[in-house]
Amino acid sequence: LKGQEFAPSHQQVYAPLRADGDKPRAHLTVVRQTPTQHLKNQFPALHWEHELGLAFTKNRMNYTNKFLLIPESGDYFVYSQVTFRGMTSECSEIRQAGRPNKPDSITVVITKVTDSYPEPTQLLMGTKSVCEVGSNWFQPIYLGAMFSLQEGDKLMVNVSDISLVDYTKEDKTFFGAFLL
Amino acid sequence: LKGQEFAPSHQQVYAPLRADGDKPRAHLTVVRQTPTQHLKNQFPALHWEHELGLAFTKNRMNYTNKFLLIPESGDYFVYSQVTFRGMTSECSEIRQAGRPNKPDSITVVITKVTDSYPEPTQLLMGTKSVCEVGSNWFQPIYLGAMFSLQEGDKLMVNVSDISLVDYTKEDKTFFGAFLL
Amino acid sequence: LKGQEFAPSHQQVYAPLRADGDKPRAHLTVVRQTPTQHLKNQFPALHWEHELGLAFTKNRMNYTNKFLLIPESGDYFVYSQVTFRGMTSECSEIRQAGRPNKPDSITVVITKVTDSYPEPTQLLMGTKSVCEVGSNWFQPIYLGAMFSLQEGDKLMVNVSDISLVDYTKEDKTFFGAFLL
C-alpha cells in the first residue's frame, strides 16, 4: 500500500503524514513584569505564564526565560496581543499649545533569535502613536502571521515600555505559536 | 503496513490521522442586533449569521442562540473582530475643560461556557479607551488565539455596548473558530 | 488496510489525508508602493514582496500582479496588517474650532476576485477614524479570518490611501494566507 494513496502525489518525502494533536503548540499568558525604566532604543522582552490558567505548552514546544523554543522546523502561525495602559502623555500638553509634536508611542515586536545568526530578526511589529489629552488610556496591539521557522529558533515578545503593559488579566496580554 | 510509517513515532494513539477538510470550522458574520439596555458589569452577547454570504459552519460545528458549540475536544484557533462606531463621548467635553477623566471605552470578550462549570471563562479580551473630541468615530478590535477546548464547550462574543456595534457589513464584524 | 483506519469514519472521500508541509501557503511583505492619486470610492491594491526576507510562497500558491492565486479549493486562513502613518488631518483644525466633523479615516480591505463572477467580494475590512491634533500619527490595522476559497480565486489587499502606507519595514505591513 503506497503513501500516495492517502495523500496527493506531490507530497514531499520529508513531510510524512502525522497526527495534528502531535504538533508543537503554545499559548502563553501575561504575568506581573518588572516595571523597568523605559530605555530609548532598547525594547525589553516580556516573560510569560506557561502552565497555569489558559496557558499551555505541548509536544516539545517549551518556554524558558522569556523565549518560546521551536522544537522542529516548519511553518508556524505566531501571534501576540499586548494591552497597554498609561496616563496622559506630555505630548498632549504640547498639542494643546498648538505645536506639532512627535507623539509618544507604544510598540510590540515579535522577535526571532537564531543562535547561529548574530542579529535577532523582527518578525512582526505593531506600533502606534499615543497622544491622549487629559485622561488615562488603554488599548491593545494585536499581531499574527505565518513564518518558516527552524528547529532551535527562539521567539520572544518585546515592548517599547514594560511599565505600560497591562498584566492584570490573562485574556488581555498573551503570546502563542503553533505548527501548521 | 503500520500507522507510524505515515506519522512520527510519538503520535498519540488517541489522535488518529484525519483529513483536514473534515475538521470542525465556523466563520460567523454580523447581523443587526437587538438593542439591549446597557447593564453595568454585564456585557451582552452578539448573535450571528451562520449560513448566508461568507458565513458557514461545517463538520459538526454548530451555531445556536449566540453560541458556537464545540463538537470535539482539541486545540482551536478562535478569532473575532468587532467594529464599533459612535458619536462624541461626554468624556471629550470634560477633557476640553482640561479635567482628567476616566475615558469611555469599548470592549470585546470571547467567552467560553462549560455547562459543568458555574462561571464562564474569558478567553480573549480587547479593550480600548475612547475619548474623541467633536466627531463621529469608528474602529475595530481584533482578537485571535489558540485554546484547548472540550467537547460541549460553548463560545460567544460579548461586547461592552451592543448599540455601538457596526452591523452593516459582514466583513467588518465577525467571529470564527477552527480545529487545528 | 483501509484509509478509515487512519482517520475518523466521517472522513469525506474528496479530502484525502495529506502532508501538512505540502499545503499552499504564502506570507508577503510590504514594498515601496507607486503613489497613486487617491480616488474617492476606489481603493487601490497594494503590491508585495514574495520571495525576499521573510516573504515566501510555496506549494503552488503563487503571487502575481498584486494578487495571491489560490491553487486549490479549501478553507484558508487569510490575514493582513497594514501600518498607516500620516500628518495631522484637517479634521483636527475643524475639531479645534469646536465643530463636529466626519473624521478622516484609514481602511484596509482583503478582497477576493473570482473570474467567473463580475463583482469582487470583500472578505475582511478594518476601518478606523483618524482625527489627530497637532502631531504625526501612525497605527496598524490587523485583519484575519477563515474563508472557503475556490481554485482560481485571487486575493488582494486594498487600502483607502496608498500614500499613508508604511512601506519601510517588512514586519509592519504584510499579507498572508494558508490552507487549513
Epitope: 506581573r32 513584569q33 518588572t34 516595571p35 525604566q37 498584566y167 | - | -
Partner: antibody, heavy 120, light 107 residues
Framework: QVQLQQWGAGLLKPSETLSLTCAVH????????WNWIRQPPGKGLEWIGE???????NYNPSLKSRVTISLDTSKNQFSLTLTSVTAADTAVYYC??????????????WGQGTLVTVSS | EIVLTQSPGTLSLSPGERATLSCRAS???????LAWYQQKPGQAPRLLIY???SRATGIPDRFSGSGSGTDFTLTISRLEPEDFAVYYC????????FGQGTRLEIK
Amino acid sequence: QVQLQQWGAGLLKPSETLSLTCAVHGGSFSGYYWNWIRQPPGKGLEWIGEINHAGNTNYNPSLKSRVTISLDTSKNQFSLTLTSVTAADTAVYYCARGYCRSTTCYFDYWGQGTLVTVSS
Amino acid sequence: EIVLTQSPGTLSLSPGERATLSCRASQSVRSSYLAWYQQKPGQAPRLLIYGASSRATGIPDRFSGSGSGTDFTLTISRLEPEDFAVYYCQQYGSSPTFGQGTRLEIK
C-alpha cells in the same frame, strides 16, 4: 538602605475621605510596585492596591470603587485616598515596596504603619 | 481572586520543637509568587521566604519553605523564643492576597 515613611490623619468620621502618604528614602521609584496594605485590629492583612513609576494602578476589586493611588515622582512619594469610609475601614495602613525580578515577586520593604480609626 | 487558607489557626509548641505551617490556595499559584511573612505585635510584617523556598536576606536557616501548585509549607526546624509570632503566606499574582495567618504561641 531603603526606608518607607508614612503619615496621614489618624481619626476620621464616617463618610469622610482617608488620605495617607508614603515617602521613599534611599531608593528609586523606577522598577518597583508601590503598595498599600491594611490590617484591621486583631485581623489579617488585606492588599489595597499598587502603582508603578509610570502611574499605572491596580486595585483590590473589593475596594476599587473607593480607592485612588497616586504618585509624585519629584518628591519620591505615593499616596492613598479612600473615600466614603466606614467603621469597617478602621485598620493599620501600611505602605510597602513590591519587588519583582524575573518571575519572583514579594514585598521587601514596609512602612511603619499608620492606625486610622473611623468613628462618629 | 485566589483565596489562601492557612492551618492551623493557632499552633502551640515549645522552644526547640519543629513547627510546620500550611498554606493552601484555592487555585494553582506560581511558586515564584508565594511568600511567607512574620509579624510581631506592633510591628510591620517581615519577609521570611520568597519564591516558595528561598530565604530572604538575614533569615536564619532554621526557616524553610516548600511546596508547589496549591499546597505550600513553612517549616521552622528548631523553634527559638523569638520565633513566636503570627505567620502569613501571600501570593503575588495580579491581585495579591494573604492567608488569614497562623499564630505560633509558646506552649
